[in-house]
């Protein structure tokens, strides 16, 4: 049994780090492999992650952490029974992928404005809470070329756009993702998308 692509891990900087790797051939990850992880700190336990399959040769493991601070470092050992396949380490603060924003809602009750709101995925006591900026993707369901990204660089998880900038009588979808500038993170996954119908009509059309 051989590791083809060594484990790479990303942390949500809260309670979960996700490690992925590829094996040299088809593998039943949960039956054949174990990823052991231990915080490098006095009296910390060695925990065992049972991986799950991620495609034919891919495996994924979720490492559980109570909290994350910048100096945390974990040792990682990938085992197949009594055989050590790979040994490495992982510093969560250097490989951050934020959680996806949630509760994306579209408010169209103000006649000439579309208001999008969403929730910050972190609690106020988390370091990332005040460091997130967002990208909102809006697209026309019937015309994928009619798609735009709005960068939200302020802290408040809201975006206002003039309804007039969208085509009238068309269904649109929106989704949002986040990143944290000071932690040099990757982008989060996109939030689930939400759909609305743009019923706005310009004044001259209504005459």
């Amino acid at each position: 049994m051989k590791v083809l692509q060594e484990p790479t891990c990303v942390s949500d900087y809260m309670s979960i780090s996700t490690c992925e790797w590829k094996m040299g051939g088809p593998t039943n990850c949960s039956a054949e492999l174990r990823l052991l992880y231990q915080l490098v700190f006095q009296s910390s336990e060695t925990h065992t992650c049972v991986p799950e399959n991620n495609g034919g040769v891919g495996c994924v493991c979720h490492l559980l952490m109570d909290d994350v601070v910048s100096m945390d470092n974990y040792t990682l050992d990938l085992w197949a029974g009594q055989q050590l396949l790979w040994k490495g380490s992982f510093k969560p603060s250097e490989h951050v992928k934020p959680r996806a924003p949630g509760n994306l809602t579209v408010h169209t009750n103000v006649s000439d404005t579309v208001l999008l709101t969403w929730s910050n995925p972190y609690p106020p006591d988390n370091y990332l809470y005040n460091d997130l900026t967002y990208a909102v993707n809006i697209w026309n369901e019937n015309d994928l070329a009619d798609s735009r990204i709005h960068n939200v660089t302020y802290l408040k998880p809201t975006l206002r756009i003039p309804a007039s900038t969208l085509k009238s009588g068309i269904s649109y979808r929106a989704r949002v993702r986040a990143w944290a500038q000071h932690y040099n993170t990757t982008w989060s996954e996109w939030s689930p998308s939400t759909k609305w119908y743009n019923s706005y009509r310009e004044p001259f059309e209504q005459r």
Partner: antibody, heavy 128, light 108 residues
């Protein structure tokens, strides 16, 4: 210094209740773990009672014999309790608090599997 | 799950090689730990995951096995090793942590 300190032990009458406490100190706040209770009757072996996850999930596991009469709860990630009800003479023992490692599959299935560090124990005597 | 530990007691001399076995009633992979306990004291972790030495434990202690059969070996018994030893088996399929009955090691 890394340590676990139990308290709340003492003498109680049969049918009575007692709540034991365990306070942890000296650990990294980052380290996910279970907090568990194990007991040892005089001159007998060790017996696992149950565990509670110290993180936000707070999931609990119990030995089959302990379900119902024994309840493990937590005030925080560093303070846990063992509530014991309807006590019997055979519950007389030294009760130990212990930190445990775990096995996890995904983020919702987490099972405690070895006790890495133990407190000094607190004595419980059930007698009339 | 049941953990059958043997022998229940043994007498040995300083310098002896001592072996204690533990048998699980079902496959527990490598989820087995060994503990040492001295009178009036809390148990101390020696070995986890069947063969991994806990921090600060002397290298004369070693563990082996997987599945259902496990062994704790003390390669050269020292005066401070006279104590009671317990195995702990963990079955995540049945959701239980069970200690063996213990092995008391005394001076011959």
């Amino acid at each position: 210094e890394v340590q676990l300190v139990e308290s709340g032990g003492g003498r109680v009458q049969p049918g009575g209740s007692l709540r034991l406490s365990c306070a942890a100190s000296g650990f990294s706040s980052s380290s996910a773990h279970y907090m568990c209770w194990v007991r040892q009757a005089p001159g007998k072996g060790l017996e696992w009672i149950g565990c509670i996850y110290a993180g936000s999930r707070g999931s609990t596991y119990y030995a089959s014999w302990a379900k119902g009469r024994f309840t493990i709860s937590k005030a925080s990630s560093t303070t846990v309790y063992l509530q014991m009800n309807s006590l019997r003479a055979e519950d007389t023992a030294t009760y130990y608090c212990a930190r445990a490692a775990f096995v996890n599959r995904g983020v919702s299935w987490i099972w405690p599997y070895y006790f890495s560090l133990w407190g000094q124990g607190t004595q419980v005597t059930v007698s009339s | 799950i049941q953990m059958t530990q043997s022998p229940s007691s043994l007498s040995a001399s300083v310098g002896d090689r001592v072996t204690i076995t533990c048998q699980a009633s079902e496959d527990i992979e490598s989820y087995l730990a060994w503990y040492q306990q001295k009178p009036g004291k809390a148990p101390k972790l020696l070995i986890y995951r069947a063969s991994t030495l806990a921090y600060g434990v002397p290298s004369r202690f070693s563990g082996s096995g997987s599945g259902t059969d496990f062994t704790l070996t003390i390669s050269s018994l020292q005066p401070e090793d006279f104590a009671t030893y317990y195995c702990l088996g963990s079955s995540y399929s049945t959701g239980s942590n069970i200690f063996g009955t213990g092995t008391k090691v005394t001076v011959l």
